[in-house]
């Protein structure tokens, strides 16, 4: 056969679907690789062909579209499973071609099992809710296109093994789940089960997402530098190790980049000749407020180093702050025989 533009195995599209549930999978060619859509391709006389390679096999084989009850079918650029089976796991290829043109891409499809509490190897999307922020909602994801708008599905929401009913501050409202006032206790995995009829059969769609309650923008403040501060003086003798921690608290801010850096005499440590090392550690609170600590270290400090200006800087979407460390050279302890003796009037 003639050459085909092969986009390879698109591992970015690691598609996971639940066993015994419907799945609709769009050919990734039109979404990520080609500059035209399926309708344009179809009207230009191009044909979309599907085939697959079973898990742990090398042999590419056509997809059987003649299974009972049309279990697997194709509609435009969508491959449908009604429903999936565990052994549908494998690499699927969609190829667009005519006599003069060919383009194809493969993607992995994993059919996963869930237990009665909806635990599974499925990678879960994370939805962040602001703590004590007023009514916030999550929506049952990825259910569009499974049934026409004329069909009214039933939706049941769960937290773990338990149906969400009579909860203090969580109310199921169809496809939405409303949190009247989100609290830390609302952290966890939430599952919606959408049940709908089709051609005399009943299908279930299960979608689980993780809710993480985070700091509210109402409470967000600019970075706070806890150290260095005015109460601690770093007093060293030449030859000793100088260690200065810069500890900064950052309020949680959605999509904010938190930065901490040191300057020495107004320059970044990389831009000066001192042998300085900086180690960073990061910790998070339960609401994802962040504490960053950068420890500036000079193994053998010189008297010149002890005259320099050491400033810790921090920046977030809320603002920028800086604080200088108080560094000084330790006055050598007096030598008894000379200084002290003189003090006592000895000649």
């Amino acid at each position: 056969s003639e050459r085909c533009d092969d986009w390879g195995l698109d591992t970015m599209r690691q598609i996971q679907v639940f066993e015994d549930e419907p799945a609709r999978i769009k050919c990734p060619l039109f979404e990520h690789f080609l500059k035209f859509n399926y309708s344009t391709a179809h009207s230009a006389g191009l044909t979309l062909i599907w085939y697959w390679t079973r898990q742990d096999r090398d042999l590419e084989e056509p997809i059987n579209f003649r299974l009972p009850e049309n279990r697997i079918s194709k509609e435009k650029d969508v491959l449908w499973f009604r429903p999936t089976l565990l052994n549908d796991t494998g690499n699927y290829t969609c190829m667009l071609r005519n006599t003069t043109y060919c383009s194809k891409v493969a993607f992995p499809l994993e059919v996963v099992q869930k237990d009665s509490c909806f635990n599974s190897p499925m990678k879960l999307p994370v939805h962040k809710l602001y703590i004590e922020y007023g009514i916030q909602r999550i929506t049952c994801p990825n259910v569009d296109g499974y049934f026409p708008s004329s069909v009214k599905p039933t939706i049941t929401w769960y937290m773990g093994c338990y149906k969400i009913q009579n909860f203090n501050n969580v109310i199921p409202e169809g496809m939405n789940l409303s949190f009247l006032i989100a609290l830390i206790s609302n952290n966890g995995n939430y599952t919606c089960v959408v049940t709908y009829p089709e051609n005399g059969r009943t299908f279930h769609l299960t979608r689980t997402l993780t809710v993480k309650v985070v700091g509210s923008p109402k409470n967000a403040v600019p970075p706070v530098i806890h150290s260095p501060n005015d109460h601690v003086v770093y007093e060293k003798e030449p030859g000793e190790e100088l260690l200065i921690p810069c500890t900064v608290y950052f309020s949680f801010l959605m999509d904010s980049r938190n930065e901490v850096w040191w300057t020495i005499d107004g320059k970044k440590p990389d831009d000066i000749t001192i042998d300085v090392t900086i180690n960073e550690s990061i910790s998070h609170s339960r609401t994802e407020d962040e504490t960053r600590t950068q420890i500036l270290s000079i193994k053998k400090v010189t008297s010149e180093d002890l005259k320099r200006s050491y400033v810790c800087h921090a920046r977030s979407a809320k603002g920028e702050v800086a604080k200088a460390a108080k560094v000084k050279q330790k006055v050598p302890a007096p030598r008894y025989t000379v200084e002290l003796a003189c003090g006592f009037g000895a000649t």
């Epitope: 237990d115 009665s116 509490c117 338990y162």
Partner: antibody, heavy 122, light 107 residues
């Protein structure tokens, strides 16, 4: 180590109510559910309902709807099961049980209280 | 509601022998089945969940098998402390339901 300690035995008259308590010690930070199960003398186990103390969610078995109320006081880590309109057939040992989290499939009855005998007699 | 039926009601076994207990569900419960042991005057104790996974601290002589509607609890070599009543429980569908129990007694 999580433990569940239940209130003592009760003798009740038909038509009255009983309230059994179940105090959890060493509770984890994560939400969990407290289940209530009863066992009539020489009989099997019968699930009555549950409550999730930190979230308020609860549900009851159809058989007990309207007669049972399960509540919880988070501040004292104590759950309560109140059964009203008692009859002689309600004579049983009432157990509370729990798992570590809301997500442990099959381990929602991991830890059990010692049981509370409720005798209904005129 | 799913009905769980255990058999036999009573099983007489000599110490050291193998005991096989059965549990049948009125409809498929997948592998969402647990087994409990209850001794006189005590609360039940979780032995097996997920049809075949031993709970923490349960000896290896206890094993579970089955899926769908047919399940088995096997005690490979009965010890004196194993004489008790055993209950199966499904947690596939609400309400979660228990079997009526199998009493394992000394022959």
């Amino acid at each position: 180590q999580v433990q569940l300690v239940q209130s003592g035995a009760e003798v009740k008259k038909p038509g009255s109510s009983v309230k059994v308590s179940c105090k959890a010690s060493g509770s984890p930070a994560e939400p969990y559910a407290i289940q209530w199960v009863r066992q009539a003398p020489g009989q099997g186990l019968e699930w009555m309902g549950y409550i999730i103390p930190s979230l308020g969610g609860y549900d009851y078995a159809q058989k007990f709807q309207g007669r049972v109320t399960i509540t919880a006081d988070e501040s004292t880590s104590t759950a309560y099961m109140e059964l009203s309109s008692l009859r002689s057939e309600d004579t049983a040992v009432y157990y509370c049980a729990r798992g570590q989290t809301l997500y442990d499939s099959g381990r929602q009855f991991d830890i059990w209280g010692q049981g509370t005998l409720v005798t209904v007699s005129s | 509601e799913i009905v769980m039926t255990q058999s036999p009601a009573t099983l007489s076994v000599s110490p050291g022998e193998r005991a096989t207990l059965s549990c049948r569900a009125s409809q498929s419960v997948s592998s969402n089945l647990a087994w409990y042991q209850q001794k006189p005057g005590q609360a039940p104790r979780l032995l097996i969940y997920g049809a075949s996974t031993r709970a923490t601290g349960i000896p290896a002589r206890f094993s579970g098998s089955g899926s769908g509607t047919e399940f088995t609890l096997t005690i490979s070599s009965l010890q004196s402390e194993d004489f008790a009543v055993y209950y199966c429980q499904q947690y596939n569908n609400w309400p979660w339901t228990f079997g009526q129990g199998t009493k394992v007694e000394i022959k």
